[in-house]
């Protein structure tokens, strides 16, 4: 038998990335009114972090928010994609069909009818695989009919998607090997939908689209990448800085405000009418009356 199995290659999957600031830790941006007079030029030139003035307000690039784009967001939406795909490049040899020149032409009636039969056969072969989506014939060539095709797999994104797709590709290999061993011509008769050459089954390549939330998170956080981490909630990855509340890495600034800087998250402590707050997490309160007497 010459069933050959390949190495796995990976490709990156693009994710639609949007960046959000956390409402609970973000000051409300005052409603902008149309600016008149010389002061406007000053406001325009004060947009920070690559923000641009649109005549009314600063338009902030991803990663920043605030009236002057001075604040760093605490949460970045990194997806994930709803589904992850895999593609297996396979070759099987169909012996129950004669190769004709018409089969080279993908728009011919002959090709369409062959495709219909082949697809129906493969749908039966792979019917027990939940990740199976379908087959796509890439090329037909002489030798009874050598069918180069892709088996398409897809699964819902979970952190274990790679294991799920790896398992599915193994089942595909098992099933195609089995059917091409069992459904063979005997005395010039194919008693099944299609018959195969047992030794003509090859798996050339397996491509799984890769999704790496940690890598995406780091990239999207740019110069703040060292401080953003991925945490999972309901199997969904969240790219957050310690300034985002409600996660295990969240920094508790008590009555202060968490603010991201290039040196990391810092608590900006507040002063009330009665107290000064200090300390790394603004947890040390000093009563003003004790200082002033």
């Amino acid at each position: 038998r010459t069933t050959s199995f390949p190495t796995v290659t990976t490709t990156a999957v693009p994710t639609n990335t949007t960046i959000k600031s956390n409402p609970t830790s973000t000051p409300t941006v005052p409603r902008t009114t149309t600016c008149f007079g010389d002061g406007c030029q000053n406001t325009a030139s004060r947009c920070k972090n690559g923000g641009t003035w649109d005549g009314l307000k600063c338009q902030c690039p991803n990663l920043y928010y605030g009236e002057l784009c001075e604040e760093v967001v605490s949460s970045i939406d990194i997806g994930p994609p709803e589904t992850i795909s895999a593609q297996m490049e396979l070759t099987v040899t169909v012996t129950s069909v004669k190769f004709t020149e018409e089969l080279k032409n993908h728009s011919s009636q002959e090709f369409q009818e062959f495709k219909q039969t082949f697809t129906e056969q493969m749908n039966i072969v792979y019917s027990g695989i939940p990740e199976y989506v379908g087959v796509n014939i890439t090329k037909l060539r002489l030798g009874s009919v050598v069918v180069e095709h892709d088996v398409l797999l897809r699964t819902k994104y979970t952190p274990e998607y790679k294991t799920v797709l790896d398992n599915a590709t193994e089942v595909v290999k098992e099933k195609i090997t089995k059917v091409t061993t069992q459904q063979i011509m005997i005395n010039d008769i194919c008693s099944d939908m299609m018959c195969f050459n047992t030794t003509g089954t090859q798996v050339q390549n397996i491509t799984v689209t890769q999704y790496d939330p940690e890598e995406d998170c780091r990239k999207m956080a740019k110069e703040y990448g060292d401080y953003f981490v991925v945490e999972y909630r309901d199997q969904k990855p969240y790219c957050i800085s310690p300034c985002e509340p409600g996660f295990s890495v969240s920094k508790n600034c008590n009555l202060g405000k968490c603010q991201m800087s290039l040196s990391g998250p810092q608590c900006l402590c507040v002063t009330t009418e009665t107290h000064w707050y200090s300390g790394e997490t603004c947890n040390q309160g000093t009563q003003k009356s004790l200082v002033y007497g």
């Epitope: 129950s96 069909v97 004669k98 004709t100 008769i189 194919c190």
Partner: antibody, heavy 121, light 107 residues
Framework: QVQLQQPGAELVRPGASVKLSCKAS????????MNWVKQRPEQGLEWIGR????????HYNQKFKDKAILTVDKSSSTAYMQLSSLTSEDSAVYYC??????????????WGQGTLVTVSS | DVQITQSPSYLAASPGETITINCRAS??????LAWYQEKPGKTNKLLIY???TLQSGIPSRFSGSGSGTDFTLTISSLEPEDFAMYYC?????????FGGGTKLEIK
């Protein structure tokens, strides 16, 4: 949809020959083997043979090897069966029948209406 | 040649009943047996192939079972249109051979 059209009846003299036709429509004629089946009253069905319209490759039931000749005319999408040296034993209904899938499948979802051949002087 | 013995050759039943028709091959034909329905004035209808695979468009009251040498066609809850002639056919080897037929009539 797939259709196999056969003439209703043929009356022939003993010792003569007859050429039965089966005109196919609704599919690509050259991609499916055509089978011929004989049915005599009270005697069930007998498979005579089959032909690949693409290159005229044939397989015969040995019993009919010297009785039937299968041919095709690709231009008119028609299959033919010539029966020779006819006797009363050849009086029967003859069906053409097609397999379900592209290639060589020996079960038949598509049948013609059949041609009744009567051998009589 | 593979001989196919079909039984019974005649069967009377009433609508709503369940009936079985049997075919026995003279040697093993694996799962490769087909069943057909024949009615006057209509083209023959394929019901089952490969022993138990229901042809598309055929009602699920028709079912096939068996492998090797013994096969059964079951029609559950007979409908008036089911009364007809039934044939089995082995599609395992040349020459393809048919059973002698079963005539199913209304009781």
């Amino acid at each position: 949809q797939v259709q196999l059209q056969q003439p209703g009846a043929e009356l022939v003299r003993p010792g003569a020959s007859v050429k039965l036709s089966c005109k196919a429509s609704g599919y690509t004629f050259t991609t499916y083997w055509m089978n011929w089946v004989k049915q005599r009253p009270e005697q069930g069905l007998e498979w005579i043979g089959r032909i690949d319209p693409y290159d005229s490759e044939t397989h015969y039931n040995q019993k009919f090897k010297d009785k039937a000749i299968l041919t095709v005319d690709k231009s008119s999408s028609t299959a033919y069966m010539q029966l020779s040296s006819l006797t009363s034993e050849d009086s029967a209904v003859y069906y053409c029948a097609r397999g379900p899938y592209y290639g060589t499948n020996p079960w038949f979802p598509y049948w013609g209406q059949g041609t009744l051949v009567t051998v009589s002087s | 040649d593979v001989q196919i013995t079909q039984s019974p050759s005649y069967l009377a039943a009433s609508p709503g009943e369940t009936i079985t028709i049997n075919c026995r091959a003279s040697k093993s034909i694996s799962k490769y047996l087909a069943w057909y329905q024949e009615k006057p004035g209509k083209t023959n209808k394929l019901l089952i192939y490969s022993g138990s695979t229901l042809q598309s468009g055929i009602p699920s009251r028709f079912s096939g079972s068996g492998s090797g040498t013994d096969f059964t066609l079951t029609i559950s809850s007979l409908e008036p249109e089911d009364f007809a002639m039934y044939y089995c056919q082995q599609h395992h080897e040349y020459p393809y051979t048919f059973g002698g037929g079963t005539k199913l009539e209304i009781k």
